[in-house]
């Protein structure tokens, strides 16, 4: 008789999830000499231990602590790039500007990027059929709790000037409900972080508005200022040209003042 299985609203665990995590870990540790000491089998065991046999709506940050410990990594605290709703450009940027880091440039972020996973209460099975949706089912699901945990730690590690890339094409350029708005903003440490600098990325070729004046950016400025962190904002009108300037910073069209 087939066992009854909970049907969740979200997509199931990414196929070949264990193999993918293990392969990514091996690849990452080969590329990053400072992480060569990491035992990828132990990393997978700790990752698995965070959600296997647990109810996928009852996951806590504590469940991920063994994984966090194994994935401990030092990134230059003044070279952190946060992002919200504009992951691809943020990643293109750090691929060129190699001394800056998004969360997904760290081991733990790299392992989980674009993946979904969940288990089932009291069985050692991974659920490949469905996983809880953050809105429709529950917020304390394995994926959401993971990103909340690593995002909080990443923000806490930041110092000096922290940059954040925001999507100027969205109706809410700064969204209080995003991971950046709900987790990272509130975990920047005022005693370490001097300035949060927002880069508002324009989508339209002919869009010449100053999106730094957007009401949601003003809201972000207010939140940050209340936390005794300075705020600055820049429009990136042409992201394609911005990336070209990152690649060719010696070009005088990239360095001259407006």
């Amino acid at each position: 008789v087939p066992r009854w299985r909970q049907q969740w609203s979200g997509p199931g665990t990414t196929k070949r999830f264990p193999e993918t995590v293990l392969a990514r870990c091996v690849k990452y540790t080969e590329i990053h000499p400072e992480m060569r000491h990491v035992d990828c089998q132990s990393v997978w065991d700790a990752f698995k231990g965070a959600f296997i046999s647990k109810h996928p709506c009852n996951i806590t940050e504590e469940d991920y602590q063994p994984l966090m410990k194994l994935g401990t990594q030092t990134v230059p605290c003044n070279k952190i790039l946060l992002w919200s709703r504009i992951k691809d450009l943020a990643h293109q940027f750090t691929q060129v500007q190699r001394d800056m880091f998004t969360l997904e440039d760290t081991l733990l972020g790299y392992l989980a990027d674009d993946l979904t996973w969940c288990g089932e209460f009291n069985t050692s099975k991974i659920n490949y059929q469905s996983c809880p949706d953050w809105r429709k089912d529950c917020s304390n699901n394995p994926v959401s709790v993971f990103w909340k945990t690593v995002s909080r730690r990443f923000a806490e590690a930041a110092c000096d000037v922290v940059h954040v890339m925001l999507n100027g094409s969205r109706s809410k350029i700064f969204d209080k409900n995003s991971t950046f708005g709900s987790v990272e903003v509130h975990n920047l440490q005022p005693e370490k972080v001097q300035t949060l600098e927002a880069w508002v990325i324009h989508g339209g070729r002919e869009d010449s508005r100053d999106l730094c004046q957007d009401p949601t950016i003003k809201e972000l400025e207010s939140i940050i200022s209340k936390r005794n962190i300075q705020f600055s904002c820049k429009n990136i009108y042409r992201p394609d040209k911005f990336l070209q300037c990152v690649k060719n910073p010696e070009d005088s069209s990239c360095t001259s003042e407006i």
Epitope: S208, N235, I236, Y237, R238, P239, K241, F242, Q244, C245, N248, E250, D251, S252, S253, C254, T255, S256, E257, I258
Partner: nanobody, 123 residues
Framework: EVQLVESGGGLVQAGGSLRLSCAAS????????MGWFRQAPGEERELVAE???????SYADSVKGRFTISRDNAKKTGYLQMNSLKPEDTAVYYC?????????????????WGQGTQVTVSS
């Protein structure tokens, strides 16, 4: 006084090529972004291609792979090589430069304009 003078326009058959030149004077050419625009009768002026001071380029989707923008800072001249021309490329072509302070990825407006050169592509 800043002057931009275009040349190289003319009548060409579809599939043919032309090379436009833009000679600049009165400005430190090597420091300026340079752009080529075109305006067909009854249409708005559109940006065709841009080149930064150091040679980074940007193209309108309609000309990508067919047009090539380049510059010779020593000669204070910009170029637009136009290959595989189509009848819809028919327009007056202008070269232009924004103010010195313009940043490649920022908002900037073109301030200096040439008088234009006619390009006609017959089918």
């Amino acid at each position: 006084e800043v002057q931009l003078v275009e040349s190289g326009g003319g009548l060409v058959q579809a599939g043919g090529s032309l090379r436009l030149s833009c000679a600049a004077s009165g400005l430190t050419f090597s420091s300026y972004i340079m752009g080529w625009f075109r305006q067909a009768p009854g249409e708005e002026r559109e940006l065709v291609a841009e080149i930064s001071s150091g040679g980074m380029t940007s193209y309108a989707d309609s000309v990508k792979g067919r047009f090539t923008i380049s510059r010779d800072n020593a000669k204070k001249t910009g170029y637009l090589q136009m290959n595989s021309l189509k009848p819809e490329d028919t327009a007056v072509y202008y070269c232009a430069a924004p103010e010195r302070g313009s940043i490649w990825y920022s908002r900037y407006e073109y301030k200096y304009w040439g008088q234009g050169t006619q390009v006609t592509v017959s089918s």
